[in-house]
Every structure is written in structure tokens, then in C-alpha cells.
Amino acid sequence: DSSKWVFEHPETLYAWEGACVWIPCTYRALDGDLESFILFHNPEYNKNTSKFDGTRLYESTKDGKVPSEQKRVQFLGDKNKNCTLSIHPVHLNDSGQLGLRMESKTEKWMERIHLNVSERPFPPHIQLPPEIQESQEVTLTCLLNFSCYGYPIQLQWLLEGVPMRQAAVTSTSLTIKSVFTRSELKFSPQWSHHGKIVTCQLQDADGKFLSNDTVQLNVKHTPKLEIKVTPSDAIVREGDSVTMTCEVSSSNPEYTTVSWLKDGTSLKKQNTFTLNLREVTKDQSGKYCCQVSNDVGPGRSEEVFLQVQYAPEPSTVQILHSPAVEGSQVEFLCMSLANPLPTNYTWYHNGKEMQGRTEEKVHIPKILPWHAGTYSCVAENILGTGQRGPGAELDVQYPPKKVTTVIQNPMPIREGDTVTLSCNYNSSNPSVTRYEWKPHGAWEEPSLGVLKIQNVGWDNTTIACAACNSWCSWASPVALNVQYAPRDVRVRKIKPLSEIHSGNSVSLQCDFSSSHPKEVQFFWEKNGRLLGKESQLNFDSISPEDAGSYSCWVNNSIGQTASKAWTLEVLYAPRRLRVSMSPGDQVMEGKSATLTCESDANPPVSHYTWFDWNNQSLPYHSQKLRLEPVKVQHSGAYWCQGTNSVGKGRSPLSTLTVYYSPETIGRR
């Protein structure tokens, strides 16, 4: 039953004389293991014998007999799956059909395989993609329908007979589906490869040539161009003529259109292979190329840089940076269109040549106010000297310079005057916009830079101003030197250090805190009477009569100042004591008599003592001694004594006479 035998192997195998053939093969005998295997060459079925006739290349039987050919032919299979065969070496006459006669216990099968052995090694086959374009990577394939384990081979790629540098990937297949050796080469053809011969060469293990296949490359590419220019260096002067010619060195397929470009932009009405430029101007300087198109696309020539030379144009100056701050660095750049580039420059500041400055740039490391002004330059090349352009203005900004505070008043200034000061400066950029004053006060600024101090104080010493733009510059402080009358005049007792007692030596000092001008005069006064003109008032021996209210005056050329009244107090023991009697020194008995102890004392009397005509002290200690009712026997001489902290004083005797009343006289 044929359906029980299933074989898989290549339909035909290819080899050449002396090589070998490896036949991958699998089978399935469903009714059991293989018992007999015979490999026939060109088997033919003999109907008479019901057997196959033909050369037996290999035979495996139960008795184990094997023909001598078996050394060349090997059955590498097994009893149930593998039917792989090897013939090594293979000969030309091995070409034809190989028949695999398989027998199991119950079944038989003849499987046929074609073997094609050539006399010489057959060539590989190169496969190319349908279209090849320049710079697009393609894969070249070289395929040989041969592979055998016992006969190693190699495939090598050549371009115009020279081995190709690109690495090829070789693969082999020895499977039931296919037997081949393949080499793949990745390759980016250039337009110059067009028409070149590519060879795939078959070699044995030693690199000996066996066979090859060749193809001619058809590389599609844009037109390849060469541009020629007269004059050859493409350097001309204004008014000269220039000719450019475009030559096509290669195009596949053929070109269709021609055009010219300048700086990447197409030139109108220029569609021939020659471009004629007559009486060129500097505007025609630039990069020229020709463009030719075919079906692949446009091709461009290399660019020709046409330089139309001319003398420098009027120059302009660029300043980095204006306005500049004093002390900063500034760079000036001279810009002038010229071809060739200028080789020499002349620089001007406010129309005057700047010595030693011959370069495109001028660098000033520290800008100063007088660097301000107009900077211009002249550029020079081999064709001539340009014109001086309008120049650029450098503005140098700096704080106000030489700031001074000026007193506008006539001198001297007196306390209470209105003082006007102005803040002056020499120069400033930008302009002064405000002023500051030190110290700060509630003063008015009637106009910018002017300060008015109403009722100037004696202690306004110095004032400074600042003129401000973007920066403030302070002037040195100016002294107002305000003149004023002596201040803080007062009387001061120098001696004695303690209280003044009658008879002491006393000195009073007239003090003042300050005076401007310093030259002063002194005056002492008591009760409107001038006492002296020295700074001190001296008493050799003070008396109570000297006590009183004293003032001193100090004056200078501005005015005079009086001290507060100062009270001079002289301390003395009670004096000028006398006893006065009221209503008189003669009093009628029975009436009232009052004796008063009068005295002059400082401090006042603190303690009184009364005495009679016998110098007997009476038990009375107040200033007044009251006798009521008075008696005749009270008649007599009385005196008193006064005491204070300084001492004691006594009065002279005063006589009291008490006379009888009419009643008493009447009774008698």
C-alpha cells in the first residue's frame, strides 16, 4: 500500500565529477521497521521477474553482504526515519536516477531521486534586483545548487576582477527541501559602478577557481557634471567677462534638461551648456553651478565661487556697546564690503586720525569721558581705498564730575539768617536729574540744585551735596561757619565751696558754652548797676549788704546774652537786736504790754531768750513777750537774745515803766 510509505528529499541533486553528493532524505514505513535497502542506479522494473534491474550502488540485506561499491556510497539512514545518502566521490556516470528500494516485513517501495553530475563544476547564478540606483543599498545574491559535507567550496565576489571589500554572508542548505550554497553581498553602488562587471566566483577549499557567473551593473543615476570656468580661478574685476561651461560626464538614463543656478537660485533664460557673463558687477559674485536632469532626478555640478573684486565701499562703524560706562571696555568694528577683504584700516576719532590703529577692530580697555564722539574708518584693499562713512557716535556715561557745594550768602553767616547753597558740578552724562543733601533737614529746595535754610541754627556746621544722574557724586562738606551770640550764659560761684558767711572771700564766674566769634566782653550787674567787666566778680570780705540778685552779660560782635538772675545769699548771726514795746514803754497797770525782740539775721532767728534787769532769763522763748495784765512790779529793764545757725546776738536794755491806775491811786 503506497500510502504507507512517505518520503521527503530534494527532487534533483546537482554535482560534478570528483565532487560528492549528499542526499538528505526522510521516510516513514508505517507497517514496521526497514528490513532491506538497495540503492539502484537507473533501476528498471522487470515485469517477468517482478524485480528491479540496474546497477546496485548499495545494498543492505539480512545476511549483511555488501558490494565493494559500498565504500563510495554510504547509507546514513536508519530502520524507520532517516534515509540520507552520501556518494563521495561522485562521477559523471552517476548521473541519472537513483532508486531507493525499501522493504519491510510486508511492504516494498521504490523511491526515485534525480542526480545530475556534470563534467566540470557548473557556474553559480547571480541574482540582481530589478533596478539599481546610485547610493541606494542593494543585495547581490550568488546561488549555487550544490552543497556537500565532504567537499567544501567558497563563493567570492569580484568587481572588475578585483575582490570586493564589502563583507559577504555565505549560507548553505542541506535539507530535505533544498540543497544549495548562497552568498549575499550588501552594496551601495555609486554612479561610477555603472557598466562595471560583477563576478561571483566558485572556488574549492584551497581557493582554486572552479567556475563563475558575471553580470554588468546597470546603475541608474542623475547626470554627473563638470563645470569649467574662464578665467580658471574665477576671480575677476568689475567689468570683466566670465564664461562657464557645463559638461556631462555620465547620465543614466540620458539627460533631458539643463539650467544654471546662482547661490541656489535658478537663473532665468539660461538653458544651454554655456553661461556667458559679460561686464560683471560685484552683485554677480556668488556660487554658480549647472543642473542637468534625467528621469532619476537633477544632477548638480560642483559650485564655482565667482569673486568679482572691487575696492572697499564706504565703511560703517559698529560700536559694542554705546552708551558706554566710564571705565568699561568698548570695541569698534569697521565694516566695509570689499573683495578681496580689506588689508588695512585707518581710524578717525572726531575727524582726527587715531595713530597706530590699522586693524578691523579697535579695542579700548577703559573708556574715559573724552573718548566720546564720532568714530569713523576707511578700509583699503589691493584695488583701492574706500570712502569714510558717516561714523558712529560713542556716548560715554559717567557720574557728575567735580561736584562742589557753594554758599551763595555774603559771609559771615549769622544765626537766624536765611542761607542759600547751590550744588555745582563740572560735567555730567547723562544730565543731572536730582540732588541730595547731608545732613537731612526740613529745608526747602526752591529750584534744582539749590538749598534754602531758613533761620539757620547756630549749630549748623557742615553741609554736603551730591549731584545725581544714574550715579551720585558727593562734594566735600562745606563749613557754614555760622556766627552767633554767646550761648548758655550763667553765673557760677567759684568760692567758697559751701554757703557764704559774712566776711568770706567770694568769687563769682560768668560762664558761657560757646561763642562765634570767640572774642567776648563781660558785664556784671546788680539791680541795674554795673559792677565789673571781667569774667569774675570778687568780694574780699562779703557783707550782708552784698546779698542780692546778680546778672552777668557776655557779648561778641553778633550780640549779647544775659544770664538768669542769680541770688547771692550771705549768712550772718543775728544783729541789730532791739526790744520794742507796745503800746509803748509806759503802760498803766492792768493793761496789756507786748515786748518784741526785733533782729536782722540770715538765716532768721530760730530761738529767742528774754532777760530782765537782773539778767535773769525769763521762761519765754518766742519773739514776743506778752505781759497781761501788766503789774507795777513788771517795771524794769528788759533785753533779748536771738540765736540762728550762725551765732547769737543780744539787744541793749529797754525799760518798761508800769504806772498805777487811777483806781489804785484813789484807793490809796
Partner: antibody, heavy 117, light 106 residues
Framework: EVQLQESGPGLVAPSQSLSITCTVS????????ISWIRQPPGKGLEWLGV???????NYNSAFMSRLSISKDNSKSQVFLKMNSLQTDDTAIYYC???????????WGQGTSVTVSS | DIVLTQSPSSLSASLGGKVTITCKAS??????IAWYQHKPGKGPRLLIH???TLQPGIPSRFSGSGSGRDYSFSISNLEPEDIATYYC????????FGAGTKLELK
């Protein structure tokens, strides 16, 4: 900080050449011009010549024929060469930086040169 | 070359006094004049540049003025440390020094 260091031979024989190197630091020779100045003993200051930022030179007409000034910006060095020295070329030699519109404010100690056989 | 005529070549002055030195140029030098103080064994010291601009740190006792071809330099309230030789320098057209003025104490 601006610094200038003049280095010379000290003693030169009459009719020989003088070479002095001025090495600068704290500024660039592409921003400042350099002048050479000398002071003979007991005499005043004498300007010899200048090398500008761009490398151009000018000389005092009295020294034009025998003076040469050059520089190496990358090494911050300025060179003075004077030929045919005589005894009256004995002096202290200074190199001094300046720039357009600004006088010389940095002076080194100078280098003393004696011309004697 | 521009010539600078400096005068006097020497002068004596008292401490606290005032001295003036003049410099006359052979052509207009556009205010590009500087004044230097030079003491033995030291490098010259720039006092004033651009006619009247005081260098930082220079006392206001020193002053300068002038224009065109005529320039002057003054020291007021003379101090002992002011004793030196003074030079004018023009830097309008290349450089030229004046001959110098030696200042001595009376």
C-alpha cells in the same frame, strides 16, 4: 594686577646690539600698546618707540635707523632690539603700556643697561 | 615730531607754598597732556592726564590746566614728599616728554 618685567643683559660692549624682553601680565597685548622709554643717568625721560595692538610700530626719528620693536601676543612678551650701542645709550630702559587717549600709568622698575668696554 | 618745551628746568619753593610748571607744544595737542612725578630709583608716577584729570589717589593739591599748545601744572600747599622731578608728556601724536623740572626746597 598689571605687572611688567623688563629683562636685559645689564652690560653691553660699544658697537654691539642690545636686546631687552618685556614680559607683561594682568592685561593683553591685543588691548594695550607698549612704548619703550629710557632715562640716561642725570638726564630726562626719552621716548624710543611704540608697538601698537595690531603689531604696527612707530619710532622716535632719532632712533629710527637702529631700533626695532616686536612682540609675541601669545607669550605676552615685547622685544626691543637696538643696534650700534654707544656709551651714551647707558640708561634705565622701561616698557610701559598705554592705549588710545590714555597716558601711561603703569611703570615697572625698568632694566639698567650700561654700555662699556 | 612734536616738541614739548618745559619750563623752568628747576625751581625752589617753600613748604606750604605754591609752584607752577608750564609746557608748550610745537602744535595743538588737543589736551592730550599728562604730568608725571619721578623720584630716583622709582618708576615715574602718573599724576594728571588729559590736561586736568587727577589720577585716583592723587591729592587735590595737584592740578593741571590748558588747551591748544599751552599747558600748566601746579602744586599748592607744598609738602616734603613733593620734592621730585616733574615731566610733561604729550600723547596726541606719538609720544614726547618735556625736559623735566627739578623741584627743590628753599
Amino acid at each position: 594686577e598689571v605687572q611688567l618685567q623688563e629683562s636685559g643683559p645689564g652690560l653691553v660692549a660699544p658697537s654691539q646690539s642690545l636686546s631687552i624682553t618685556c614680559t607683561v601680565s594682568g592685561f593683553s597685548l591685543t588691548s594695550y600698546d607698549i612704548s619703550w622709554i629710557r632715562q640716561p643717568p642725570g638726564k630726562g625721560l626719552e621716548w624710543l618707540g611704540v608697538i601698537w595692538t595690531g603689531g604696527g610700530t612707530n619710532y622716535n626719528s632719532a632712533f629710527m635707523s637702529r631700533l626695532s620693536i616686536s612682540k609675541d601676543n601669545s607669550k605676552s612678551q615685547v622685544f626691543l632690539k637696538m643696534n650700534s650701542l654707544q656709551t651714551d645709550d647707558t640708561a634705565i630702559y622701561y616698557c610701559v603700556p598705554h592705549y588710545y587717549g590714555y597716558a601711561m600709568d603703569y611703570w615697572g622698575q625698568g632694566t639698567s643697561v650700561t654700555v662699556s668696554s | 615730531d612734536i616738541v614739548l618745551t618745559q619750563s623752568p628746568s628747576s625751581l625752589s619753593a617753600s613748604l606750604g607754598g605754591k609752584v607752577t610748571i608750564t609746557c608748550k607744544a610745537s602744535q595743538d595737542i588737543n589736551k592730550y597732556i599728562a604730568w608725571y612725578q619721578h623720584k630716583p630709583g622709582k618708576g615715574p608716577r602718573l599724576l594728571i592726564h588729559y590736561t586736568s584729570t587727577l589720577q585716583p589717589g592723587i591729592p587735590s593739591r595737584f592740578s593741571g590746566s590748558g588747551s591748544g599748545r599751552d599747558y600748566s601744572f601746579s602744586i599748592s600747599n607744598l609738602e616734603p614728599e613733593d620734592i621730585a622731578t616733574y615731566y610733561c608728556l604729550q600723547y596726541d601724536n606719538l609720544l614726547t616728554f618735556g625736559a623735566g623740572t627739578k623741584l627743590e626746597l628753599k
